[in-house]
């Protein structure tokens, strides 16, 4: 067991004349926070797999307001480290994703809005107990500087946190078969501690926290005898000794649920029932409290003052789900007249009107282009006594004054969440789906329904949305 620690040193515009404006403004103050997701680096898991080693959310940084005319400086950061506890051995090679989020604190209806500013990723080799490793990465026009390390929690030691050390019971030497713990020569290697509840008679371990079964026994704690009396509908290969088929590996074998979650098989895969304070496909996200800001889209978090008590998100109008992550489709009421396109922006409904119509609900007929200006490089197009603005890329609205919302068309399928991103949009897929737009179901054997043609983005990767 141990802790992965991440220290963010700075987040700001990259060098060069094309540096971005500050993400905050006098009209729209904001603050930053960070999320880190860790996975074992050499695993065969797909890119959209959950954060199997753990995930953490930082506190919010100080509120920042842009100084007019001044270039964007490095932005004020949250205090402290991001810490991701790991229960088992440190894998040595790991993958990370670090996201920088902006929380806008303007007067939005329904509270603050969140948007993803930048995301960096990498795979690194790192020994537990080693010094801080530093990194500098660019994401779009932004530059992120950070350090990270993995450290073991006593009594674990070693580069993988798999050796256990305890103070000596006798001053002169360690017990039979146990060596001194270098570099802690005054401590001794301790016998391995198997997974809690592992059967002392039928189970054993070669790594701390595991439970391997002796022949004839099965189950996560080696407490289930392998049946030889009935050979009906077994799963695995035939056993030469009994003439019966013994159970082969099932989706719950080895218990994929972390943090004490219980596993139950489903027709397609498995399902984890997580204890309070944990969630995620494998109960891998731990200790979430209201301080971690689990409620999206301005949801109000109540309860959950400590990791052992559950939190509840009270969602603003237009959002639902346990974390207010799902948008309610208010466009189904067809509020836009004259063929206008309805956009549900969460905090408001917006109608994108057809040529020749205007107004909040496209209720007004328009004159032609006379005296009509289109902002941000848009051009006015006449036709049949009506006008419209043909807007430059990235802008929309009647006069091209509005920044186009790449998420407005709700491009993420199967309940995927859409985030505005520096280069377009990002889809965060619901469990069981993958693909740039969450369009592909993930098959239980790990294969996907992706076509054989070159695959597009994995979920969560940025891409332009044109």
């Amino acid at each position: 067991a141990g802790v992965f620690e991440l220290q963010i040193h700075s987040f700001g515009p990259g060098p060069g004349p094309g540096a971005p404006r500050s993400p905050c403004s006098a009209r729209l103050p904001c603050r930053l926070f960070f999320r880190v997701c860790l996975k074992p680096g050499l695993s065969e898991e797909a890119a959209e797999s959950p954060c199997a080693l753990g995930a953490a959310l930082s506190a919010r940084g100080p509120v920042y307001t842009e100084q007019p005319g001044a270039p964007a400086p490095d932005l004020p950061l949250p205090d402290g480290l991001l810490q991701v506890p790991f229960r088992d051995a440190w894998p040595g090679t790991f993958s990370f994703i670090i996201e920088t989020w902006r929380e806008e604190l303007g007067d939005q209806i329904g509270g603050p809005a969140w948007s993803l500013l930048a995301r960096v990723a990498g795979r690194r080799r790192l020994a537990a107990g080693g010094p801080w490793a530093r990194d500098i990465q660019r994401a779009g026009a932004w530059e992120l500087r950070f350090s990270y390390r993995a450290r073991c929690e006593p009594p674990a030691v070693g580069t993988a946190c798999t050796r256990l050390c305890r103070p000596r019971s006798a001053p002169s030497r360690c017990g039979p078969g146990l060596r001194p713990c270098a570099p802690l020569e005054d401590e001794c290697e301790a016998p391995l501690v198997c997974r809690a509840g592992c059967s002392p008679e039928h189970g054993f371990c070669e790594q701390p926290g595991e439970c391997r079964c002796l022949e004839g026994w099965t189950g996560p704690l080696c407490t289930v005898p392998v049946s030889t009396s009935s050979c009906l509908s077994p799963r695995g290969p035939s056993s030469a000794t009994t003439g019966c088929l013994v159970p082969g590996p099932g989706p719950c074998d080895g218990n994929p649920c972390a943090n004490g979650g219980s596993c139950s098989e489903t027709p397609r895969s498995f399902e984890c029932t997580c204890p309070r304070g944990f969630y995620g496909l494998r109960c891998e996200v731990s200790g979430v409290t209201c301080a971690d800001g689990p409620c999206f889209n301005g949801g109000l978090c109540v309860g959950g003052a400590d990791p052992d008590s559950a939190y509840i998100c009270h969602c603003p109008p237009g959002f639902q789900g346990s974390n207010c992550e799902k948008r309610v489709d208010r466009c189904s009421l067809q509020p836009c007249r004259n063929g206008g396109l309805c956009l549900d922006l969460g905090h408001a409904l917006r109608c994108r009107c057809r040529a020749g119509f205007a107004g909040p609900r496209c209720e007004h007929d328009l004159d032609d282009c006379a005296g009509r200006a289109c902002a941000n490089g848009g051009t006015c197009v006449e036709g049949g006594g009506a006008h419209r603005c043909s807007c430059a890329l990235g802008f929309g609205g009647r006069d091209c004054r509005e920044r186009a919302d790449p998420c407005a068309a709700r491009p993420c399928a199967h309940g995927g969440r859409c985030y505005a991103h520096f280069s377009g949009l990002v889809c965060a897929c619901a469990p069981g789906y993958m693909g740039a737009r969450c369009e592909f179901p993930v098959h239980p054997d790990g294969a996907s329904a992706l076509p054989a043609a070159p695959p597009g983005l994995r979920p969560g990767d940025p891409q332009r949305y044109l």
């Epitope: 060098p15 797909a46 890119a47 994703i97 960096v120 990723a121 990498g122 795979r123 690194r124 080799r125 530093r134 990194d135 500098i136 990465q137 660019r138 994401a139 779009g140 530059e143 280069s423 994995r458 990767d461 940025p462 891409q463 332009r464």
Partner: antibody, heavy 117, light 107 residues
Framework: QVQLVQSGAEVKKPGASVKVSCKAS????????IHWIRQAPGQGLEWMGY????????EFHQNFKDRVTMTRDTSTSTVYMELSSLRSEDTAVYYC??????????WGQGTTVTVSS | AIQLTQSPSSLSASVGDRVTITCRAS??????LAWYQQKPGKAPKLLIY???SLEDGVPSRFSGSGSGTDFTLTISSLQPEDFATYFC?????????FGGGTKLEIK
């Protein structure tokens, strides 16, 4: 403006060492890493390693681990790359480049190293 | 180490043409891919980083796209100064690795 200026061409015998310098200017020297990349005649690019001028931490490609040394002199904003036990296949143009882990944004003009008996 | 396969290895085109060069990674590298341009006797020059971000000072006719394992560099309208060799580079894993290069020649 940012500039990386490298030392001149070198001709070495097999088994010898070569030390190439890279002088940085136009930015805060300790703010970015300096990477070394080489290119054999008519070939592609091969990353050798980098030095963090702030901490003097170095990381090398496995292929060069035992033969390469990278150092820096903050007083002159210069980084040095020394390659020992030279062999004929080390004949290449050696470039220094400024950057982080996912970008090399400015490159030196290159130093040709010829290893010949 | 992660391998990058560039295609084509060489390409003939005319001024004004639209040109596409592809780079395929041996495994998922998310969007950690950069593109460099190199002219004979010169150092490489950064064009695109993190798959689709245009480096300062690089003309907008250059664009990058893709993520995961498949990436593309597009030059929308070739100019005489664009004839050079182009390399892709992954920066997801250490060591960073480069593609074999695509030589773009005048037809």
């Amino acid at each position: 403006q940012v500039q990386l200026v490298q030392s001149g061409a070198e001709v070495k015998k097999p088994g010898a060492s070569v030390k190439v310098s890279c002088k940085a200017s136009g930015y805060t020297f300790t703010r970015y890493w300096i990477h070394w990349i080489r290119q054999a005649p008519g070939q592609g690019l091969e990353w050798m390693g980098y030095i963090n001028p702030t901490t003097v931490y170095t990381e090398f490609h496995q292929n060069f681990k035992d033969r390469v040394t990278m150092t820096r002199d903050t007083s002159t904003s210069t980084v040095y790359m020394e390659l020992s036990s030279l062999r004929s296949e080390d004949t290449a143009v050696y470039y220094c480049a400024r950057g982080g882990s996912n970008f090399f944004d400015y490159w030196g003009q290159g130093t040709t190293v010829t290893v010949s008996s | 180490a992660i391998q990058l396969t560039q295609s084509p290895s060489s390409l003939s085109a005319s001024v004004g043409d639209r040109v596409t060069i592809t780079c395929r990674a041996s495994e998922n590298i998310y969007y950690n891919l950069a593109w460099y341009q190199q002219k004979p006797g010169k150092a490489p020059k950064l064009l695109i980083y993190t798959a689709n971000s245009l480096e300062d000072g690089v003309p907008s006719r250059f664009s990058g796209s893709g993520s995961g394992t498949d990436f593309t560099l597009t030059i929308s309208s070739l100019q005489p100064e664009d004839f050079a060799t182009y390399f892709c580079k992954q920066a997801y894993d250490v060591p960073p690795t480069f593609g074999g290069g695509t030589k773009l020649e005048i037809k």
